[in-house]
């Protein structure tokens, strides 16, 4: 499938906008840093000499690789030193080590301005004056701030975003119709990232296997009527999607990924029924559509597991054959015949299967020594269910914003050293769960549960990475990909942290609190509350209460106070003072 | 119920000295701060020393290395020394008994008049 220009034929594939579309993308993930006007001038740059290699695929340097164009353009920056420091000796090495160097620059935390949204007639006036600049620069703000986000979900979102300004900025009111559909989409797209930076870490991290072994596990719970090839086949080409977006090979990401939206649909009859509705929606929304679509209703007539994998006499003959593939058929059969179960524990219990028959086919009966394997997996199948009721028991009670805060206490008690915007971030994403899985029937919980908190820890494992300050956090994030969460979930206080020293400036709050939104305020308050425990790891559960709930009526009192700055300086002294006493600091 | 009743004021010559008293009647629980407040003529009411029963210390606004804060729980009085008085330290002194939670536990004397002339 060699073409004499890699360039053209992309270009081809995609069409233009699309094209320019994901070279932006690729271009912000990369230099993060760079306005806006100098990327589009890039943009613009690779697109005509990609027509010009449309048109003749023989011209000047259309047989370079895309890595090669790419990176030249990059590195044609004149201010790449100054920007990004060490990052422009990348462009000293030769492919592929250059581009390697680029993605090993990316930077999950990017020292950038929040996105703050403009008023309501201010965005329709820009999207009615420049339609196409003002895309270009939503995929760019996007892009820059989410280096791994899935380049070609991206492009959904974007066109999603235009449908939102077509139809609202033509609106009677066009704040009640465009204000919620812009909070779906960010919302949508924050989980989209952070799904998305999982997978990539599985692959960079962990490697291929690891993530191929995601793949066929929910990928047999979603299409559990197809055959084991069929499941093999679309995770062999899945994996090469997701290994391209993540390596930053944008253009053959978003390539691959319609032809194989294009194979599910014409294979349908042999993978899932429930694929029809996607399958009539065009591209963009296709591959959403499969992405996202239902689990499809279990066989009816599954025989018992035990028959091929524990009772049968040829069960390390077959493993010694071919272990992956065998391991492979454990795991796509376990996960067909359970879609109540976390993909990260079925992913335990083939890790526990292979265990043991590596240690039994080497023993003097390996019948007897693996025949009671399944039962193994009781405990490991027991934990995550019994710790999944008992955080929804105490979501129900408190509510979201007060569940976040026993989590926040909980993780800060773990993991003090990790700095408090992450501590806070990754609580009240930790919490977020309650709301998003505990109203979902005890069959669906688990899978909702727990694999959602696997994509939370890994975000508290990549920003960790970037400023490594706790061997805890480390070790529970490099171990094992699947035992992160059990990792976490062991870690109990921890003895060696001092605390660290009171500083009531930390304490100190202004008026400017009062006009934050509520979701701001929560973060504020969460943000002490953190700080409180590192100043008093050892405080109780109804000493920190008392001093939040005072910190609230506090906030309230000033707020409505007339002089309210007077009253956060007079009476922020005070709770100061009294929080002091309270814990004993 | 808490009781507090300061003494100590008085009209000073700018540089010289004063010590307040405040002596509580009733239990302050060993969560509980002492703090001394004070409002100049015209203009809010300002926080500057706080002790707890533990003895915890903060000093506020620009009294600190002038004046200290220190307390006799035998006595269950809290005193304020204060050195090199300055025309600025003219005012009302209040003190104030206060513990979590501030809105039900919130204490106050009726204030003692310290002038300092220059």
């Known amino acids: 499938d060699a073409h004499k220009s890699e360039v053209a034929h992309r270009f081809k594939d995609l069409g233009e906008e699309n094209f320019k579309a994901l070279v932006l993308i690729a271009f912000a993930q990369y230099l993060q840093q760079c306005p806006f006007e100098d990327h589009v001038k890039l943009v613009n740059e690779v697109t005509e000499f990609a027509k010009t290699c449309v048109a003749d695929e023989s011209a000047e340097n259309c047989d370079k690789s895309l890595h090669t164009l790419f990176g030249d353009k990059l590195c044609t920056v004149a201010t790449l030193r100054e920007t990004y420091g060490e990052m422009a000796d990348c462009c000293a090495k030769q492919e592929p080590e250059r581009n390697e160097c680029f993605l090993q620059h990316k930077d999950d935390n990017p020292n950038l301005p929040r996105l703050v949204r403009p008023e309501v007639d201010v965005m329709c006036t820009a999207f009615h004056d420049n339609e196409e600049t003002f895309l270009k620069k939503y995929l760019y703000e996007i892009a820059r701030r989410h280096p791994y986000f899935y380049a070609p979900e991206l492009l959904f979102f974007a066109k999603r975003y235009k449908a939102a300004f077509t139809e609202c900025c033509q609106a009677a009111d066009k704040a009640a119709c465009l204000l919620p559909k812009l909070d779906e989409l960010r919302d949508e797209g924050k989980a989209s990232s952070a799904k998305q930076r999982l997978k990539c870490a599985s692959l960079q991290k962990f490697g291929e296997r690891a993530f191929k072994a995601w793949a066929v596990a929910r990928l047999s719970q979603r299409f559990p009527k197809a055959e084991f090839a069929e499941v093999s086949k679309l995770v062999t080409d899945l994996t090469k999607v997701h290994t391209e977006c993540c390596h930053g090979d944008l253009l053959e990401c978003a390539d691959d990924r319609a032809d194989l939206a294009k194979y599910i649909c014409e294979n349908q009859d042999s993978i899932s029924s429930k694929l029809k509705e996607c399958c009539e929606k065009p591209l963009l929304e296709k591959s959403h559509c499969i992405a996202e679509v239902e689990n499809d209703e279990m066989p009816a007539d599954l025989p018992s597991l035990a028959a091929d994998f524990v009772e049968s006499k040829d069960v390390c003959k077959n493993y010694a054959e071919a272990k992956d593939v065998f391991l492979g058929m454990f795991l796509y059969e376990y996960a067909r015949r359970h879609p109540d179960y976390s993909v990260v524990l079925l992913l335990r219990l083939a890790k526990t299967y292979e265990t043991t028959l590596e240690k039994c086919c080497a023993a003097a009966d390996p019948h007897e020594c693996y025949a009671k394997v399944f039962d193994e997996f009781k405990p490991l199948v027991e934990e995550p269910q019994n710790l999944i009721k008992q955080n929804c028991e105490l979501f129900e009670q408190l509510g979201e914003y007060k569940f976040q805060n026993a989590l926040l206490v909980r993780y800060t008690k773990k993991v003090p050293q990790v700095s408090t915007p992450t501590l806070v971030e990754v609580s009240r994403n930790l919490g977020k769960v309650g709301s998003k899985c505990c109203k979902h029937p005890e069959a669906k919980r688990m899978p909702c549960a727990e694999d959602y908190l696997s994509v939370v820890l890994n975000q508290l494992c990549v920003l960790h990475e970037k400023t490594p300050v706790s061997d805890r956090v480390t070790k529970c994030c490099t171990e094992s990909l699947v035992n992160r969460r059990p990792c976490f979930s062991a870690l109990e206080v921890d003895e060696t942290y001092v605390p660290k020293e009171f500083n009531a400036e930390t304490f100190t709050f202004h008026a400017d609190i009062c006009t934050l939104s509520e979701k701001e305020r929560q973060i504020k308050k969460q943000t002490a509350l953190v700080e409180l425990v590192k100043h008093k790891p050892k405080a109780t559960k109804e000493q920190l209460k008392a001093v939040m709930d005072d910190f609230a009526a506090f906030v309230e009192k000033c707020c409505k106070a007339d002089d309210k700055e007077t009253c956060f300086a007079e009476e922020g002294k005070k709770l100061v003072a009294a929080s002091q006493a309270a814990l004993g600091l | 119920q808490v009781q507090l009743v300061e003494s100590g004021g008085g009209l000073v010559q700018a540089g010289k000295s004063l010590r307040l008293s405040c002596t509580a009647s009733g239990s302050i629980p060993s969560i509980g701060v002492t703090g001394w407040h004070r409002q100049a003529p015209g203009k809010q009411r300002e926080l500057v020393a706080t002790i707890s029963q533990g003895g915890h210390i903060n000093y506020f606004e620009s009294v600190k290395g002038r004046f200290t804060i220190s307390r006799d729980n035998a006595k269950n009085t809290v005193y304020l020394q204060m050195n090199s008085l300055k025309p600025e330290d003219t005012g009302v002194y209040y003190c104030?008994?206060?513990?979590?939670?501030?809105?039900?536990?919130?204490?106050w004397g009726q204030g003692t008049q310290v002038t300092v002339s220059s």
């Open positions: 104030n008994a206060f513990w979590l939670p501030l809105r039900l536990n919130d204490y």
